[in-house]
């Protein structure tokens, strides 16, 4: 489960950057196509990548057809700040720019992959770990939620610097901090335990800075399909990432006969990649491949961006509903190895365990399962979101909502196929899953239209903190809890050690409903805040004066 | 005052089996970790296996000359550490000493913090 | 399985002197070294652990010193008290080992 853990969080961070940066780059280029007259011209957009005002706009999840916006007095254009001379204007870019927006792209998604390799390599020595350093459950809990809350409280903080300041240095940075801290914590001696909790706090916040900011980075390097591409590529870098740092964890451990150099791995190639971005990417504006980067400049409080997302009910919904996702996965990837284990245990087809850990095989069923979804999900959600938006405005948060739905109806059979097949019980984690990730790439689109380019690094970050607040951080333990719970009021025997943790489970479903609601309600308001979204847009296009956020 | 206290040791036949207990008092035994170390007659130490607490599973481990056929328990309710063992040989005749870890709440130390005035095991035929 | 080397196996001293007991490792164990003290006829009693950490209720005299593969445990004026059997005890890797000890006997 967990190589798909903060992918929502990439996803967001990449894709809700493309669509308003596309129409940021289609109106600079119907203002290029003005040919310096002043006013918005009606000949065709001039340069790649840049389409006129009513044209389509080109996501992850394909394209939909834009209702022709624009400031009073000129309907059916986009705004125009800027004559061809003005701040706006540009010169096509050369070959050689195109390979170099590649290459930046190449090596931030490298990064993205370094960063969840970094972070799986721990999870795949986190058993050696814990029987070094004497680590009881608790204390293995401890390190989990000091990671995930560091990661959480250091998200916005990113997102507010992302927003406002120079995010190469901020991102390299990020890098070579936690590659230094991993590297650093393989040469913790056994009696510092506390020094290992602050060492997966500290790789938390600079795993935060990258998760928070890479993403608008490549959604500012490129336009169209091949944003579309580059976004893909980036966050598809998650599951990939995640798998490798499993096998790198255990090889390397096994080579080296000492878990520890796991650990020295990944921060040496991190830094390598960091000393790369630093070289190789560029410090774009945001808006930049919309041609808008000069006119960006409005910038407002932290504050006022906060007040203006909780206000937008389309992101506050599928944020919440972002939540449920995380708060089911979360749930599912700690204890569905250890239920089917269990279910196993009662079909008399394995053994009671009695030294941990328990269900490895079925962790590694389970961690393929949820990589492969992982990969499959995103496909079919944004094949389903391209096909309905054909059909009707409010694709994007009605697909979401019936993954949802559909994902809840498997999740609630895997507890029912459980008893008897445990085939059965994993042809229903693997539909069940594909249904819940489909919504990943659509929820980032929802972001991307309905928040502004200068504030989505914030909104990616706040998303994060919230799917993991009400999600991930507190679902395996509320989980475990409700389990204990149950089994406390019945006799002790496998029988009920299965039950009660199939029981508990079954509030995963629930939570995945709730979460389909949600995703219902952004669909009531998703149309109105995408157009609000845009006319914001239209307004920082404006001169400096009539700029209003 | 913390304290352990072994007892069921005796001469034995060798195959024949054995149940060493250990009683304690003086800290909260359900969080803590314990172990059991021999030693054979002028010879050094040896650890034999050591049992955590309930909070990480009651999980054991073994020397691997003993695997299989020495089991270590533990009753949180009655603060007592066991070692079940089975199939004795003639090198398993030692003094059989229960340990404590020390404990840090969320993690625990290998090392012995404190030591019971052991118990001897003979197996001879 | 870390192997543990204790040297010398015995040590003849007269009360006053100072001694330091060496035990060496059959691979790199960062600081995971612990030393007992086992008089005749009684169980052992922790020293020193993390190769350098002192225990409450131990006297001061006792020092140890040491990482990665060697570690010394220092006795500073070697007190009657003292004569008894040093053992030193690896917690890197399972399983736990012990070294063979050393004896500090009466010169």
């Known amino acids: 489960m967990m190589c798909l853990e903060c992918a929502s969080a990439a996803a967001g961070g990449a894709e809700e950057e493309e669509a308003d940066a596309e129409r940021r780059r289609r109106r600079r280029g119907a203002q290029r196509g003005a040919g310096g007259s002043g006013c918005c011209g009606a000949r065709g957009a001039g340069g790649a990548g840049v389409s006129a005002a009513g044209d389509e706009v080109q996501t992850l999840s394909g394209s939909v057809r834009r209702a022709p916006t624009g400031p009073p007095g000129t309907p059916g254009t986009p705004g125009c700040a800027a004559t061809a001379k003005g701040p706006g204007a540009q010169q096509p870019k050369p070959a050689s720019l195109g390979r170099g927006r590649g290459a930046a792209a190449a090596i931030l998604s490298l990064g993205n992959v370094l960063n969840y390799l970094d972070r799986y390599t721990v999870a795949g020595v986190l058993l050696d770990a814990q029987q070094h350093f004497g680590v009881k459950d608790r204390g293995a809990g401890l390190l989990q939620s000091v990671f995930i809350c560091s990661f959480m409280v250091a998200a916005p903080i990113f997102g507010y610097l992302g927003d406002r300041f120079n995010r190469k240095v901020i991102l390299s940075c990020g890098i070579f901090f936690w590659s230094a801290v991993t590297f650093s914590s393989s040469f913790i001696p056994q009696q510092y335990f506390w020094l290992l909790v602050l060492s997966r706090g500290l790789v938390g916040i600079g795993e935060a800075s990258y998760s928070t900011i890479a993403p608008t980075i490549i959604g500012d390097l490129f336009t169209k399909n091949t944003r579309t591409l580059m976004l893909s590529v980036f966050y598809f870098a998650i599951p990939l990432g995640s798998g490798l740092g499993y096998i790198t964890g255990s090889s390397v451990k096994q080579a080296a006969g000492d878990w520890h150099w796991a650990l020295r791995v990944s921060p040496v190639l991190g830094m390598i990649t960091g000393t790369l971005i630093l070289i190789l990417v560029p410090a774009t504006k945001r808006g930049h491949a919309d041609q808008l980067g000069d006119q960006l400049k409005a910038r407002t409080s932290w504050l006022r961006d906060m007040k203006a997302l909780i206000r937008n009910r389309s992101y506050v919904f599928s944020s919440l509903a972002t939540s449920a996702v995380s708060f089911a996965t979360g749930a599912l990837g700690m204890w569905i190895p250890l239920y089917l284990h269990r279910a196993q245990v009662v079909q008399k087809t394995a053994e009671t365990c009695n030294s941990p850990p328990c269900g490895a095989k079925d962790s590694l069923i389970f961690g393929a399962i949820t990589c492969f979804t992982g990969f499959l999900g995103v496909v079919t959600g944004a094949g389903a979101t391209r096909w309905c938006r054909l059909k009707t405005q409010r694709a994007d948060p009605l697909v979401c909502a019936v993954g949802m739905l559909g994902s809840a109806i498997f999740i609630c059979l895997i507890f029912v196929a459980a008893k008897s097949s445990i085939v059965g019980a994993y042809i229903c984690i693997f539909v069940g899953e594909t249904l819940l990730f489909s919504n990943w790439a659509i929820t980032a689109d929802i972001l991307m239209y309905v928040v502004i380019p200068t504030r989505r690094a914030t909104a990616v970050a706040l998303q994060s903190f919230t799917s993991h607040l009400l999600g991930d951080a507190g679902s395996p333990y509320l989980i475990g809890f409700i389990s204990d719970l149950i089994r406390q009021s019945t006799k002790d025997s496998p029988l009920w050690e299965f039950l009660s943790l199939g029981y508990a489970l079954m509030l995963c479903p629930f939570v995945v409903v709730l979460g389909g609601m949600f995703f219902l309600a952004t669909a009531l308001f998703f149309v109105s805040d995408r157009a609000r979204a845009e006319q914001q847009v239209n307004q920082l296009a404006m001169p400096p004066a009539s700029v209003k956020v | 005052e913390v304290q352990l206290v072994e007892t069921g040791g005796g001469l034995v036949r060798p195959g024949s089996s054995l149940k060493l207990s250990c009683a304690t008092s003086?800290?909260?035994?359900?969080?803590?970790?314990m172990s059991w170390v021999r030693q054979a007659p002028g010879k050094g130490l040896e650890w034999v296996a050591l049992i955590k607490d309930k909070n990480s599973n009651s999980e054991a481990n073994y020397a691997e000359s003993i695997k299989g056929r020495f089991t270590i328990s533990r009753d949180d309710s009655k603060s007592r550490v066991y070692l079940q063992m089975n199939t004795l040989r003639d090198q398993d005749t030692a003094t059989y000493y229960c340990?404590?870890?020390?404990?840090?709440?969320?993690?625990?130390?290998?090392?012995?913090?404190?030591w019971g005035q052991g118990v001897m095991v003979t197996v001879s035929s | 399985d870390i192997v543990l080397t204790q040297s010398p196996p015995t040590l003849s001293v007269t009360p006053g002197e100072s001694v330091s007991l060496s035990c060496r490792a059959s691979q790199g164990i960062s600081t995971s070294i612990h030393w007992y003290q086992q008089r005749s006829n009684e169980s052992p009693r922790l020293l020193i652990k993390?190769?350098?950490q002192s225990i409450a209720g131990i006297p001061s005299r006792f020092s140890g010193s040491g990482s990665g593969t060697d570690f010394i445990l220092s006795i500073n004026r070697v007190e009657s008290e003292d004569f008894s059997v040093y053992y030193c005890?690896?917690?890197?890797?399972?399983?736990?080992?012990f070294g063979p000890g050393t004896k500090l006997e009466v010169k």
């Open positions: 993390y190769a350098s």
């Open positions: 003086g800290f909260t035994f359900s969080d803590t970790w």
């Open positions: 340990t404590r870890h020390e404990d840090f709440y969320y993690y625990s130390g290998y090392y012995f913090d404190y």
């Open positions: 005890q690896q917690t890197y890797s399972l399983p736990l080992t």
